[in-house]
C-alpha cells in the first residue's frame, strides 16, 4: 500500500550531490525519504562517491541490458 512521490520543494535537501528526493507514502507508517543518486554517487543520501572502476562497470552492464 506504499507508493513513491516526488519530494516537496522544501524537502529536496534531504539528498545531496544532485540526488532526486522521493517520499515513501505509507498510510500505516510515518513518511520516509529515499534518494535516487546522480551517476557517481551512492548511499542513503547520495553522500558517497562511487569509484570510477565501479561506475564504468555499471555503464557496461547498463549497455549490455539494453
Amino acid at each position: 500500500t506504499s507508493h513513491l512521490v516526488k519530494c516537496a520543494e522544501k524537502e529536496k535537501t534531504f539528498c545531496v550531490n544532485g540526488g532526486e528526493c522521493f517520499m515513501v507514502k505509507d498510510l500505516s507508517n510515518p513518511s520516509r525519504y529515499l534518494c535516487k543518486c546522480q551517476p557517481g554517487f551512492t548511499g542513503a543520501r547520495c553522500t558517497e562517491n562511487v569509484p570510477m572502476k565501479v561506475q564504468n562497470q555499471e555503464k557496461a552492464e547498463e549497455l549490455y541490458q539494453k
Epitope: F14, V16, G18, G43, A44, T47
Partner: antibody, heavy 116, light 107 residues
Framework: EVQLVESGGGLVQPGGSLRLSCAAS????????IHWVRQAPGKGLEWVAA????????NYADSVKGRFTISADTSKNTAYLQMNSLRAEDTAVYYC?????????WGQGTLVTVSS | DIQMTQSPSSLSASVGDRVTITCRAS??????VAWYQQKPGKAPKLLIY???FLYSGVPSRFSGSGSGTDFTLTISSLQPEDFATYYC?????????FGQGTKVEIK
C-alpha cells in the same frame, strides 16, 4: 524532546588524541544524519564530518581526513568523533547536529584545546 | 569545494529596521541553502532551510529567498533579541560549507 549532548572535550598536547561523544535522545537515531561542526575561538563555523547511521556512510572535511574518524553506535544512540594527531588549529568548540533538511538540532558544544 | 561569501561581514542597525544579509555561492547550489543565528557562547539555531522555508518556531519576521548562486536573509523589523551573528550554509554537495558570518550589532 530532541536532545544532543556532547562530551569528551578537554586540553590535549599536539599530536595527542581525544574521543568526543554525542549522546542523542528524543528521535529515531538510526534514521537521521549526524554531523560534527566546529568553531575556533572568535571564528566562524566549519563543517568537519558526517555519518549516516542507517548505512554507515561517512564524509570528512579535507582538513581532518585521515586524522579524524566518525562513527555511531545505534544501540547507544551515540555518535563519536575520534580525533588523532591533533594540531593547534584543531582548537575549537565542537558541536554535533542532526540533519533532516538542514542542521535542525544542535548540542551545546564541547571545547577542545590543543596546546603544549 | 563550494565557497559561500556573505556580505556584509558586520552591520549596525536599530530596533525596527529592515535588515538584509546576502550570500553568494561560488557555483549553482539550487535551493540547498540554510540560514542560522548564533549568539555568543551558544550553539547555532536554524532559521531558514531550502533557501526560503521558515523553520518551526522561528518568528515570521525572518524570511529567505534565492536560488542558484544568490541568496538573501531578511529580517523585516529587527527586534532586540535578533542582535547576533548569522551564517548561511550550502548542503548541495559534500563538503558542506558555511559563509564567514554577518554580525548584526546595535547602532
Amino acid at each position: 524532546e530532541v536532545q544532543l549532548v556532547e562530551s569528551g572535550g578537554g586540553l590535549v598536547q599536539p599530536g595527542g588524541s581525544l574521543r568526543l561523544s554525542c549522546a542523542a535522545s528524543g528521535f529515531t537515531f538510526s534514521g537521521t544524519w549526524i554531523h560534527w561542526v566546529r568553531q575556533a575561538p572568535g571564528k566562524g563555523l566549519e563543517w568537519v564530518a558526517a555519518i549516516t547511521p542507517a548505512d554507515g556512510s561517512t564524509n570528512y572535511a579535507d582538513s581532518v581526513k585521515g586524522r579524524f574518524t566518525i562513527s555511531a553506535d545505534t544501540s547507544k544512540n551515540t555518535a563519536y568523533l575520534q580525533m588523532n594527531s591533533l594540531r593547534a588549529e584543531d582548537t575549537a568548540v565542537y558541536y554535533c547536529a542532526t540533519y533532516m533538511f538542514a542542521m535542525d538540532y544542535w548540542g551545546q558544544g564541547t571545547l577542545v584545546t590543543v596546546s603544549s | 569545494d563550494i565557497q559561500m561569501t556573505q556580505s556584509p561581514s558586520s552591520l549596525s542597525a536599530s530596533v525596527g529596521d529592515r535588515v538584509t544579509i546576502t550570500c553568494r555561492a561560488s557555483q549553482d547550489v539550487s535551493t540547498a541553502v540554510a540560514w542560522y543565528q548564533q549568539k555568543p557562547g551558544k550553539a547555532p539555531k536554524l532559521l531558514i532551510y531550502s533557501a526560503s522555508f521558515l523553520y518551526s518556531g522561528v518568528p515570521s519576521r525572518f524570511s529567505g529567498s534565492g536560488s542558484g548562486t544568490d541568496f538573501t536573509l531578511t529580517i523585516s523589523s529587527l527586534q532586540p533579541e535578533d542582535f547576533a551573528t548569522y551564517y548561511c550554509q550550502q548542503s548541495y554537495t559534500i563538503p558542506m560549507t558555511f559563509g564567514q558570518g554577518t554580525k548584526v550589532e546595535i547602532k
